[in-house]
């Protein structure tokens, strides 16, 4: 059975997966795939590590933590509804049928931000001012300083610029209406 994780459209999704290296530097290959874990390997591989490095990855998929310490949690950048589904994290421990398999079900919810035809409000009031840095480990928040009044188009532009600069990748759980 799979364990469920949730994210919102436009956010980064975080899918946790860990193992304990037998000894420092004694890493085992890990693969991440879209779809439930098959008998061997991963189907539709989106990211793979070997005993030394991340040797395959696709756009928008990256490891959040330090995989050399056993943190092989996956981040999917700027998710869309199409990213919903089951993901397989497979720790490829040497030996027959020794692999550890985790099936993680990612549920993507539509973004909560809903435009309303009234006067615009300060950006900082409309959003909880949290941006995720592209660091290791689960998302860490940083607070922005005050921003001037800003309309919906500017918000979209700003969000794209932030994402492109890789300073930030999500406007998290805003739950707010822009007026």
């Amino acid at each position: 059975s799979e364990v469920e994780y949730r994210a919102e459209v436009g956010q980064n999704a975080y899918l946790p997966c860990f193992y304990t290296p037998a000894a420092p530097g004694n890493l085992v290959p890990v693969c991440w795939g879209k779809g439930a874990c098959p008998v061997f390997e991963c189907g539709n591989v989106v990211l793979r590590t070997d005993e030394r490095d991340v040797n395959y990855w696709t756009s928008r998929y990256w490891l959040n933590g330090d995989f050399r310490k056993g943190d092989v949690s996956l981040t999917i950048e700027n998710v869309t509804l199409a990213d919903s589904g089951i993901y397989c994290c497979r720790i490829q421990i040497p030996g027959i049928m020794n692999d550890e398999k985790f099936n993680l079900k990612l549920v993507i919810k539509p973004a909560k931000v809903t435009p309303a035809p009234t006067r615009q409000r300060d950006f900082t009031a409309a959003f909880p001012r949290m941006l995720t840095t592209r660091g290791h480990g689960p998302a860490e928040t940083q607070t922005l300083g005050s921003l001037p009044d800003i309309n919906l188009t500017q918000i979209s532009t700003l969000a794209n610029e932030l994402r492109d600069s890789r300073l930030a990748n999500d406007l998290r759980d805003s739950g707010a209406t822009i007026r």
Partner: antibody, heavy 117, light 107 residues
């Protein structure tokens, strides 16, 4: 043998700051995360934050952001916890611990910090 | 933050008994849960990681189970040296969080 040796007890005045140390032996701190955990008398455990000594990257519990600063010196295999603007609420035992990667398999013996005028 | 609610907060049992401590996470943490034992005046000691894996050197009378949000620590055939406070801890998301502890006493 894996060991985490912490610095001795501290008695400091309110408003001051203090820097506690945690020196590892039997392993290289660059290969693990080092965490700090607070425990007040007869209370539970509170995670303060952690450092990845390999790159200096830190994470903190929101409650300790601005209060605690975690650093590491890989040349001496030592991690540090600096606490600022001390008040009586900071009186506690502070433990360092290593993780591999998300659970704490070895702990230091603890450093007792007393904040009193 | 993920809250870890541990129960009971204290527990009295007799030697040889089997006792169960539960830990409930406020959101899904899969199996990324650990249990620690802290004897009076001592440092915490790892018992179980990944919900059910026994740490090296821990007696087999300790066992862990559960996943997602519900977890249990079971101690069978209670011994005098098991007098301690037990804590659960989630390591999936920052900030890492501990349960409030369960103080075990022997009658």
């Amino acid at each position: 043998e894996v060991q985490l040796q912490q610095s001795g007890a501290e008695l400091v005045k309110p408003g001051a700051s203090v820097k506690l140390s945690c020196t590892a032996s039997g392993f290289n701190i660059k290969d693990y995360y080092i965490h700090w955990v607070k425990q007040r008398t007869d209370q539970g455990l509170e995670w303060i934050g952690r450092i990845d000594p390999d790159n200096g990257e830190t994470k903190y519990a929101p409650k300790f952001q601005g209060k605690a600063t975690i650093t590491a010196d890989t040349s001496s295999n030592t991690a540090y916890l600096q606490l600022g603007s001390l008040t009586s609420e900071d009186t506690a035992v502070y433990y360092c611990a290593r993780s591999s990667p998300y659970y704490f398999d070895y702990w230091g013996q603890g450093t007792t910090l007393t904040v009193s005028s | 933050d993920i809250q870890m609610n541990q129960s009971p907060s204290s527990l009295s049992a007799s030697l040889g008994d089997t006792i169960t401590i539960t830990c409930h996470a406020s959101q899904n943490i899969n199996v990324w849960l650990s249990w620690y034992q802290q004897k009076p005046g001592n440092i915490p000691k790892l018992l179980i990681y990944k919900a059910s894996n026994l740490h090296t050197g821990v007696p087999s009378r300790f066992s862990g189970s559960g996943s997602v949000t519900g977890f249990t620590l079971t101690i069978s055939s209670l011994q005098p040296e098991d007098i301690a406070t037990y804590y659960c801890q989630q390591g999936q998301n920052f900030p890492y969080t501990f349960g409030g502890g369960t103080k075990l006493e022997i009658i």
